[in-house]
Amino acid sequence: EEELQVIQPEKSVSVAAGESATLNCTATSLIPVGPIQWFRGVGPGRELIYHQKEGHFPRVTPVSDPTKRNNMDFSIRISNITPADAGTYYCVKFRKGSPDVELKSGAGTELSVRAKPS
């Protein structure tokens, strides 16, 4: 059985202010059961960007249908990007529990924001 991997394919993504940014992530296994969460930054101060199962994230939408059976694509799209969104984003797999336990993080994708074309 292969070890669970969280694949963030791109090292960096550059987006113009006002556009949408797609951050790609896929997991190699549905097991163990548990959600994917997206964070900006690392450590205790990291910012939750998206939780697959709970919360309200108005600017963030999943790229793939999250209700689709056996879906392992956890890519997200963030709309209306501003310079404040710049940073490194991590796709993190959790094991379901009370609380959920962090299992594996992707390698991270750095989002840089270009000035809006005039």
């Epitope: 991997q5 694949i7 394919p9 791109e10 090292k11 896929t26 390698a107 991270g108 994708t109």
Partner: antibody, heavy 119, light 103 residues
Framework: DVQLVESGGGVVRPGESLRLSCEAS????????MTWVRQAPGEGLEWVST????????YYADSVKGRFTISRDNSKNSLYLQMNSLRADDTAIYYC????????????WGLGTLVTVSS | ALTQPASVSANLGGTVEITCSGG????YGWYQQKSPGSAPVTLI????NRPSNIPSRFSGSTSGSTTTLTITGVQAEDEAVYYC?????????FGAGTTLTVL
Amino acid sequence: DVQLVESGGGVVRPGESLRLSCEASGFTFRNYYMTWVRQAPGEGLEWVSTISDTGDTAYYADSVKGRFTISRDNSKNSLYLQMNSLRADDTAIYYCAKSWIWWTFFDYWGLGTLVTVSS
Amino acid sequence: ALTQPASVSANLGGTVEITCSGGNSNHYGWYQQKSPGSAPVTLIYADTNRPSNIPSRFSGSTSGSTTTLTITGVQAEDEAVYYCGGSSTGDGIFGAGTTLTVL
């Protein structure tokens, strides 16, 4: 055993069209992204196009965008590449490849079919 | 773009490393082609994963922006062209290929 069998290659003139097919077996075709990769004579591998598992999303190399169309029929376990406005530099062996979890990785390949564009 | 050496050589039974670097990829794969026009074979995908039909003498590792294919106990049949592949769609996906000559 996973098998990918390409067909439809041949000799055509510049500007003409050709449709390649790839018949898949040995895995659940509808669950995987599929890809076309080509290799011109004496050259390296070049990614051409990829299609999502459901067929609703397609990706193309700049060199073929607007001329080639990838499609699939999951009921027939088949992948297709419609090639229009063919040019001499499209001459290559075209391989069908099964994409792994992330679509730029490939775990199985077909034997290929040769497309020659010549006047 | 993904950069790899045009050629490397190895002694029969020895160990050889082929490197690939650059591009915007976090992960890499390796593909073997024994002769021009023959079907490529996947050796490694996503850095370290080896398909079940691939001998254990082939292994992959990635550190930072560089990925390495290691062949331990090189066999005569390993003489081939080896292509690295990236995970980022903007990389063109494949390197130019490295020809391995077995001495």
